[in-house]
């Protein structure tokens, strides 16, 4: 979390950015907040991007003010326009790419003052695992696969069985590169699995970490997948 | 009121060049792109490209050699030019607004203009 | 480009019948798929956008939904102007396209 106050002494308001992480090709949102104002007109919210010359996006009078866009935002920012009036500054960014990654301003200027906050933006892929039984498998197999992981994440097998143990000579993984040629579908096959025990795959990068557990029984087998982002830091 | 008029449409001659224009009132130039969509008779839509409020465009590749899109907002107008005509480029010509600045549809519709291309 | 594979292309239904028309993208356009009805000789009008989100005035017998990249547009209950063809839309990634359209006639 980002609290940042105007530099103008006396009139300063307080505005509080998030620090987030975008998933590419999805929607992301670079969250900011600031002291509310009564009138929507005397409200203006300006998004910045270091290193890039025009504006992420312009909000004043009550709409959107877009000529001095930079190129690479047209037509893939967006406010939520019924919620500025409540304190919320927050951008739609529609269709992350790699290169949306950065630091952002979030800049505000109401009635009572002026102030802005800075937000670090983190451009990778992260998707949920799901472990699956391989019955092709000559012996007791589990795979974990994941469509979309960038940059290339680690993956570690654990047991609740055996804690502690070391799956590495047992597992075998692999990255095969999407369509897209930048983000990979992530494959790992443990071998030599035992029954009546619960395995999980953890699969993690510096954006995201998430987990498949399967839990293998004489009678059924149940899944459970959770992802966690790394890096959301209020500012 | 939203509201987008296109004028210009007519017959052209194959070879030929077509200009249209769209006023738009009820909404700023510099807060929407307008897009540029036609449809030949009895066909479906087609989507030719946008200029944005910032004065940039981006263009349907099948037709970037022989398009040009530009804007006026002093007189809150778009203008939409296309070179070397032929006969399946005959349609009505629609310009449009998005719903959202982030265009996740086209809400706003002008009449649209019929462009016939024939000798 | 992205294919939109609109189906089926043409339909006969009653007044109060459920009609549902489909559109399968053939990559990932995420919720940029929008709908519209269409008359003769007039201009196309959004009903849906953002896959599922009815726009002001449509009525609430129009409703979009998605499913990884297949889009429905469901009339739950077919109206005697509602007769029209129907097109969806995809504006993820240029160039934006369109499906073929779905023709609604009365039986």
């Known amino acids: 979390l980002i609290i940042g106050f105007g530099i103008s002494g006396r009139h300063s308001i307080t505005v509080t950015t998030v620090a987030s992480a975008g998933n590419i090709g999805e929607d992301g949102i670079l969250s900011c907040t600031f002291e509310p104002d009564i009138k929507l007109s005397d409200i203006v919210i300006q998004w910045l991007k270091e290193g890039v010359l025009g504006l992420v996006h312009e909000f004043k009078e009550g709409k959107d003010e877009l000529s001095e866009q930079d190129e690479m935002f047209r037509g893939r920012t967006a406010v939520f326009a019924d919620q500025v009036i409540v304190g919320n500054a927050s951008l739609r960014l529609k269709n992350v790419q790699l290169t949306d990654a950065g630091t952002y301003k979030c800049y505000i200027i109401t009635s009572k003052g002026k102030g802005n906050a800075n937000l670090e933006y983190k451009t990778g892929a992260f998707s949920m695992p799901e472990v699956n039984v391989d019955y092709n498998a000559s012996s007791e197999t589990l795979r974990c696969e994941a469509p979309r992981w960038f940059p290339q994440p680690t993956v570690v097998w654990a047991s609740q069985v055996d804690q502690g143990a070391n799956f590495s000579e047992v597992s075998n993984t692999s990255f095969e590169l999407n369509s897209e040629n930048v983000t990979m579908k992530v494959v790992s096959v443990l071998y030599n699995v035992t029954i009546n025990n619960t395995y999980s795959c953890m699969i993690e990068n510096d954006i995201a970490k998430a987990t498949g557990d399967i839990k293998v029984t004489e009678s059924e087998i149940k899944r459970r997948s959770h992802l966690q982002l790394l890096n959301s830091k209020a500012s | 009121e939203v509201q987008l008029v296109e004028s210009g449409g007519g017959l052209v001659q194959p070879g030929g060049s077509l200009r249209l224009s769209c006023a738009v009132s009820g909404f700023s130039l510099t807060s929407y792109g307008v897009q540029w969509v036609r449809q030949a008779p009895g066909k479906g839509l087609e989507w030719l490209g946008v200029i944005w409020s910032s004065g940039s465009t981006d263009y349907n590749a099948a037709f970037l050699s022989r398009l040009t899109i530009s804007k006026d907002t002093s007189k809150n107008t778009v203008y939409f030019q296309m070179n070397s005509l032929r006969a399946e480029d005959t349609a009505v010509y629609y310009c449009?607004?998005?719903?959202?600045?982030?265009?996740?549809?086209?809400?706003?519709w002008g009449q649209g203009t019929l462009v016939t291309v024939s000798s | 480009d992205i294919q939109m594979t609109q189906s089926p292309s043409s339909l006969s239904a009653s007044v109060g019948d459920r009609v549902t028309i489909t559109c399968k993208a053939s990559?990932?356009?995420?919720?940029?798929v929008s709908w519209y009805q269409q008359k003769p000789g007039k201009a196309p009008k959004l009903l849906i956008y953002?896959?599922?989100n009815r726009y002001t005035g449509v009525p609430s017998r129009f409703s979009g939904s998605r499913s990884g990249t297949d889009f429905t547009l469901t009339i739950s209950s077919l109206q005697p102007e509602d007769f029209a063809t129907y097109y969806c839309g995809q504006t993820y990634s240029y160039p934006f396209t369109f499906g073929q359209g779905t023709k609604v006639e009365i039986k």
């Open positions: 953002g896959a599922s």
């Open positions: 990559e990932k356009v995420g919720t940029y």
């Open positions: 449009a607004r998005d719903v959202t600045t982030i265009v996740e549809g086209f809400a706003h």
